[in-house]
């Protein structure tokens, strides 16, 4: 028996809900008296959803997952996840029997979109040529960890002397802190980018030092 | 009616090999999953081996993988078991079966593989 | 893998009893779990299939229930030809098709 699924991850936003597709193909005289479908997690064989005998034997996964009943004759045995989290990501396997039996997984990959960074300057007051300066970027409860580059106002990348942390939440999104050390010229801007590596998204932070005053676009 | 009917068991010397044969008959053999089951002397059941009705998929129990293969000739209506390196723990009868989500339905009459010098 | 732990291992009773075996995964399996009868020398024979469905030509004393991890097969009144030993089985999902150990019922 031939199940199919998505050879990609399903990528899902964190609190959407996600669709892991999977199908066969009937033969002629197909019944969904004979149908036994089995969602589980891969790797531990845990039990996500089923159906068996004629009927929905229910989701064993928080009550955050569903088939699509109406379309399991034609073969559609895929699976509705909902509000994703963090902690879902992960293969899933698929396994259909009937007579015969097949199995197939799909990996879901999590995403969530970094917010938009913050700076702060370390002094930030007083600052003249030459000072050595502490910016801070800062972006939150993103997913999965980020990738973090520096730059100069002429777009020059800046990677000596930048420590990057990401600390997971209790949710499992990261929150993202770069510090970037810095000798001060006449002046300047600084930016930093924080790129989600699934979502291919960036999100962008600057500041500019004139002298007096400084700002924060 | 279902039938299925094995052969090939036999005694054989630890290290030996053994094929196993059993013959469908009844049913559309090619749209059914099957499998091999073997019962050790005054044991219970152990679930031997499964292939998928195309011959795609085949699984083993731990106890038989790299020595054991099953394979089917569906235009011969016949499921075998291929039984390499045997071991005196493989002494058992063992039976063909028909099935899968729902059971096996039906099962073959048995054939003796006894390992021994 | 999924392992089955049935009990008792073995129990005595009469023609006419009312007997019980119970079976429990290791995980749950949903209703993936089968019941067979075995007579001496013969081939195991299913009864019950998805915990509770009686397998076509089965006599309607052998009744299964459960979901999950816990099954039972009931025979609600013993017949000579019941004096042997059922083996529970699951087939959740990918092999390995694991069995329990076995239930010998014999004549008290």
């Known amino acids: 028996l031939e199940v199919q699924v998505p050879e990609d991850p399903v990528v899902a936003l964190v609190g959407t809900d996600a669709t892991l597709c999977c199908s066969f193909s009937p033969e002629p005289g197909f019944s969904l008296a004979q149908l036994n479908l089995i969602w589980q997690l891969t790797d531990t064989k845990q039990l996500v959803h089923s159906f068996a005998e004629g009927q929905d034997q229910g989701s064993a996964y928080a009550n955050r997952t569903a088939l699509f009943p109406d379309l399991l004759a034609q073969g559609n045995a895929s699976l509705r996840l909902q509000r994703v989290r963090v902690a879902d990501e992960g293969s899933f396997t698929c396994f259909v029997s009937i007579r015969d039996f097949g199995s197939a997984a799909v990996s879901l990959q999590v995403a969530a979109p970094y917010s938009k960074p913050s700076m702060t300057l370390e002094p930030n007051k007083d600052l003249r040529p030459g000072d050595t300066v502490t910016i801070t970027c800062s972006s939150y409860r993103g997913y999965p960890e980020a990738e973090v580059f520096w730059q100069d106002g002429q777009g020059v990348p800046l990677t000596g002397n930048v420590t990057t942390s990401q600390m997971a939440n209790e949710q499992g999104l990261f929150d993202v802190h770069s510090v970037l050390r810095v000798v001060l010229g006449a002046n300047g801007t600084y930016s930093c980018l924080v790129r989600n590596p699934v979502l291919q998204q960036d999100a962008h932070g600057s500041v500019t030092i004139t002298g007096q005053p400084m700002t924060f676009p | 009616e279902v039938q299925l009917f094995q052969s090939g068991g036999g005694l054989v010397q630890p290290g030996g090999s053994l094929r196993l044969s059993c013959a469908a008959s009844?049913?559309?053999?090619?749209?059914?999953?099957m499998s091999w089951v073997r019962q050790a002397p005054g044991k219970g059941l152990e679930w031997v081996s499964a292939?998928?009705?195309?011959?795609?998929?085949?699984y083993y129990a731990d106890s038989v993988k790299g020595r054991f293969t099953i394979s089917r000739d569906n235009s011969k209506n016949t499921l075998y078991l291929q039984m390499n390196s045997l071991r005196a723990e493989d002494t058992a009868v063992y039976y063909c079966?028909?099935?899968?989500?729902?059971?096996?339905?039906?099962w073959g009459q048995g054939t003796t593989v006894t390992v021994s010098s | 893998d999924i392992q089955l732990t049935q009990s008792p291992s073995s129990l005595s009773a009469s023609v006419g009893d009312r007997v019980t075996i119970t079976c429990r995964a290791s995980?749950?399996?949903?209703?993936?779990l089968n019941w067979y009868r075995q007579q001496p020398g013969k081939a195991p024979k299913l009864l019950i299939y998805?915990?509770?469905s009686l397998q076509s030509g089965v006599p309607s004393r052998f009744s299964g229930s459960g979901s999950g991890t816990d099954f039972t097969l009931t025979i609600s009144s013993l017949q000579p030809e019941d004096f042997a030993t059922y083996f529970c089985?699951?087939?959740?999902?990918?092999?390995?098709?694991?069995f329990g150990q076995g239930t010998k019922v014999d004549i008290k």
């Open positions: 079966a028909r099935g899968v989500g729902r059971g096996f339905d039906y």
């Open positions: 292939i998928s009705g195309s011959g795609g998929s085949t």
């Open positions: 009844g049913f559309t053999f090619s749209s059914y999953a």
């Open positions: 998805a915990a509770s």
């Open positions: 089985q699951q087939t959740y999902s990918t092999p390995p098709w694991t």
């Open positions: 995980q749950s399996i949903s209703i993936y």
